[in-house]
């Protein structure tokens, strides 16, 4: 078998709304993956997991089952939606989030995915980990890639 | 319907500490958050802090710091208070209030029955 | 901290005759999205505090409509029209805004 190449594309769009009062910051955060069969032949994409991270805590998770097919030598581009909640302990960014003196309130998260694909019985994980920049302070439309955080020191290969 | 019972009244002497608990029914525990509120003989009230039973975490008013340790036991669905090194001015009814509502539509909708301290050597 | 302003510590009113108690706020409790986090408690001799108004003109359930609450983002007025004799105890307004969540002194209604 050939590989299934899984490319983490960005961030496509981040909502954004605010519990006032509990200090808590919902984002509804929509990504990107592109998915690239170099088979001869179909393969399921079964499911994907993604998680996202703030400052070392997991602030959102989200599974997607049963997704699609992507028959041979095809590419399906994927968007899957993580709910995040930045509450409790990082209530702190919520003043930062909201505060009106500055235009643009971007936060380093780090988006983790696993995609399992399957063909003939058998199963494959890919995973892949991004830092991405995303806006607290209002609803964002991204340009594909515009998100990233190139300026985080990636661990040596 | 949606309750909150409340220890009973409680007599501690001067530097000791007391726990109060506060039991709920009629609705999810896990689902609100549980505050505690303090009056004085007389007086007004005061907010102590809260509990979100669901992940333990609390937030306490910077007054009661170091006197008030807010817990809760989601398999009894009861909210506790511990008061620590107790002095006469801990003397007082404490109540522990429901957080109803929804999102940036909270209040104090449900009160408990209220816990008397008395510190007295 | 929000300090929390009742001027009366008592109103003497006169059953069946309408009555209005007022509170300040040290800070606006107007939110840019439009709520403003005032509330108001009434608790009756020996009783625990039971909610009134919530989001300063809301009615909270089961509160006869003869409650009702108004005012700008620092000043409040908790109306009672028809007074009963039921309705005597201590108001306490209260803001749940920011943390320390604070209340007012109190005001007593008294029946003349």
């Known amino acids: 078998p050939r590989s299934i190449d899984v490319k983490y594309i960005g961030v496509k769009s981040a909502y954004v709304s605010y519990d006032v009062q509990k200090r808590t910051i919902y984002l509804n955060i929509t990504n990107t993956l592109n998915i690239t069969n170099n088979n001869y032949y179909s393969v399921e994409v079964e499911n994907i997991t993604a998680q996202v991270q703030f400052s070392k805590t997991v602030i959102g998770k989200a599974r997607l089952n049963n997704i699609t097919i992507i028959g041979p030598l095809d590419m399906k581009q994927i968007d899957y939606t993580v709910p995040t909640v930045i509450a409790e302990e990082m209530s702190y960014m919520y003043d930062f989030c909201t505060l009106i003196s500055i235009k643009v309130h971007n936060i380093v998260l780090m988006m983790q995915v696993t995609v399992t694909t399957t063909y003939f019985g058998h199963s494959e994980q890919i995973s892949q980990e991004r830092y991405q920049y995303v806006d607290c302070g209002r609803n964002t439309t991204y340009q594909l890639g515009q998100s990233e955080y190139l300026n985080v020191l990636q661990p040596q290969q | 319907q949606v309750q909150l019972q409340q220890s009973g009244a409680e007599l501690a002497k001067p530097g000791a500490s007391v726990k109060l608990s506060c039991k709920a029914s009629?609705?999810?525990?896990?689902?609100?958050?549980m505050h505690w509120v303090k009056q004085r003989p007389g007086q007004g009230l005061e907010w102590i802090g809260y509990v979100n039973p669901s992940s333990g975490y609390t937030k306490n008013n910077q007054k009661f710091k170091d006197k008030a340790t807010l817990t809760a036991d989601k398999s009894s669905s009861t909210a506790y208070m511990q008061l620590s090194s107790l002095t006469y001015e801990d003397s007082a009814v404490y109540y522990c209030?429901?957080?109803?509502?929804?999102?940036?539509?909270?209040?104090?909708?449900?009160w408990g029955t209220g816990t008397t301290v008395t510190v007295s050597s | 901290d929000i300090v929390m302003t009742q001027a009366a510590p008592s109103v003497p009113v006169t059953p069946g005759e309408s009555v209005s108690i007022s509170c300040r706020s040290s800070k606006s409790l107007l939110h840019s999205n439009g709520n403003t986090y005032s509330y108001w408690f009434l608790q009756r001799p020996g009783q625990s505090p039971q909610l009134l108004i919530y989001r300063m003109s809301n009615l909270a359930s089961g509160v006869p409509d003869r409650f009702s609450g108004s005012g700008s983002g620092t000043a409040f007025t908790l109306r009672i029209s028809r007074v009963e004799a039921e309705d005597v105890g201590v108001y306490y307004c209260m803001q749940h805004l920011e943390y320390p969540y604070t209340f007012g002194g109190g005001t007593k209604l008294e029946i003349k």
């Open positions: 009629g609705y999810t525990f896990i689902s609100y958050w």
């Open positions: 209030a429901r957080e109803g509502g929804s999102i940036s539509d909270w209040y104090f909708d449900v």
